[in-house]
């Protein structure tokens, strides 16, 4: 089995997590993609998903989460704005590919959000403050329900299913961009990995 790895990101309340999930292959470009949280002892829960089929460069906003799929570069951009301490947890991007199981993108993200406080060495909020303007978006976050044993997702709570932002733009201030790359385990890599493991097993017994 593929070892699941995590990357840890530490941010302060009010900041923005900005990650890029790298899905690499063209065949996944139009596939519906989702951002999930994995809580201890629970199945992965889908917080937001792109439309189906996923539209190019079309922001989908669900609460404080904004997803934007860039087909031409094979990147799904995930932003979680105005982070709160309770947002801390383990997250992952997945690609829906029914009837098959969702395809998980590696690595998972361990987000740690701490209370912000002034006087932190090296931080000057006034000089490093960024302002992001997210265009108004209305979308239906209709995420599929899966019950596969390996990666299970749930539909988001009813309250987040229909989301409409006001006509005015949302100003996202005090933003720190966390840029990361997620590697997709491609078919051939997986094939090579299995071959390597088979060889290792073979040599171990001889």
């Amino acid at each position: 089995a593929t070892k699941l790895t995590e990357e840890k990101y530490e941010l302060k309340e009010g900041q923005t997590l900005d990650v890029k999930c790298d899905y690499t292959l063209e065949k996944f470009a139009s596939s519906q993609k989702a951002w999930q949280i994995i809580r201890d002892g629970e199945m992965p829960k889908t917080l937001a998903c792109t439309e189906r089929p996923s539209k190019n460069s079309h922001p989908v906003q669900v609460g404080r989460i904004i997803l934007e799929d860039y087909h031409d570069h094979g990147l799904l951009r995930v932003r979680m704005v105005n982070l709160q301490v309770e947002d801390s947890g383990l997250y992952q991007c997945v690609i829906y590919q029914p009837p098959k199981e969702p395809h998980m993108l590696f690595d998972r993200i361990r987000l740690v959000v701490t209370k912000g406080f002034s006087g932190t060495p090296g931080s000057n909020e006034n000089s490093t403050q960024n302002v992001y303007k997210i265009p108004p978006t209305t979308t239906k976050a209709l995420c599929p329900l899966y019950t596969s044993p390996r990666t299970v997702t749930q539909a988001p709570p009813k309250s987040t299913a229909d989301v409409s932002t006001p006509d005015s733009e949302i100003n996202l201030t005090n933003v720190t961009d966390i840029i990361r790359e997620q590697k997709l385990i491609s078919e051939e890599d997986l094939e090579q990995k299995l071959i390597s493991e088979e060889d290792l097993h073979h040599h171990h017994h001889h």
Epitope: L25, E26, K27, E187
Partner: antibody, heavy 121, light 111 residues
């Protein structure tokens, strides 16, 4: 093991045509875009063009120097990419390499050994 | 089209010494802070070989004396301790926009 083997090179007169083939093996051919890159003797590398996958409707893109004269195609059932070269000029003389990227706008990790095309009268 | 200009055109470095090759793009080759800029090594009679992808990622099997850095329009390939087998021509290449383009190449020799 990923392998790319070019064929079809040779001597052709200016104004003539030639079709190069790139036979691929060792990976799921239909999943990846395929590119052609050329190199004139003693010169640098020049990207010729690329063809995307079925998911992207086999879209093609070309360098300005060959646009309108060269056509890239692929046959996923044969694991083969092609470069049809028409209205050849002496400056098209080069070694032509077939290369495969690692995904959307990704790096060229795999290259063929190249096939020589000579355009001369 | 994005023009990539490498400097110097040729470089002679003593064995064991550091070699540095620069690549400047006429416009940014970044998308979301990802630099779609790659480095290749080519020896006579051989196809190019990938060394570094997306500015700073070392390709599997490439010795760690090779490293890449930079973003936006300015990039650098560094060989920390030149070995005899590193004599070759080095190319940068961008894939951020069509048409993809290569730098003109830098010939690396031993002093």
């Amino acid at each position: 093991e990923v392998q790319l083997v070019e064929s079809g090179g040779g001597l052709v007169q200016p104004g003539g045509s030639l079709k190069l083939s790139c036979a691929a093996s060792g990976f799921t051919f239909s999943t990846y875009a395929m590119h052609w890159v050329r190199q004139a003797s003693g010169k640098g590398l020049e990207w010729v063009g690329r063809i995307r996958t079925k998911s992207s409707n086999y879209a093609t893109y070309y360098a300005a120097s060959v646009k309108g004269r060269f056509t890239i195609s692929r046959d996923d059932s044969k694991n083969t990419a092609y470069l049809q070269m028409n209205s050849l000029k002496t400056e098209d003389t080069a070694v032509y390499y077939c290369t495969r990227d690692m995904g959307i706008r990704r790096q060229f990790a795999y290259w063929g050994q190249g096939t020589l095309v000579t355009v001369s009268s | 089209d994005i023009v990539l200009t490498q400097s110097p055109d040729s470089l002679a470095v003593s064995l064991g010494e550091r070699a540095t090759i620069n690549c400047r793009a006429s416009e940014s080759v970044d998308t979301f802070d990802y630099s779609f800029l790659h480095w290749y090594q080519q020896k006579p009679g051989q196809p190019p070989k990938l060394l570094i992808y997306r500015a700073s990622n070392l390709e599997s099997g490439v010795p760690d004396r090779f490293s890449g850095s930079g973003s936006g329009t300015d990039f650098t390939l560094t060989i920390s301790s030149l070995q005899a087998e590193d004599v070759a021509v080095y190319y940068c290449q961008q894939s951020n926009e069509d048409p993809y383009t290569f730098g003109q190449g830098t010939k690396l020799e031993i002093k």
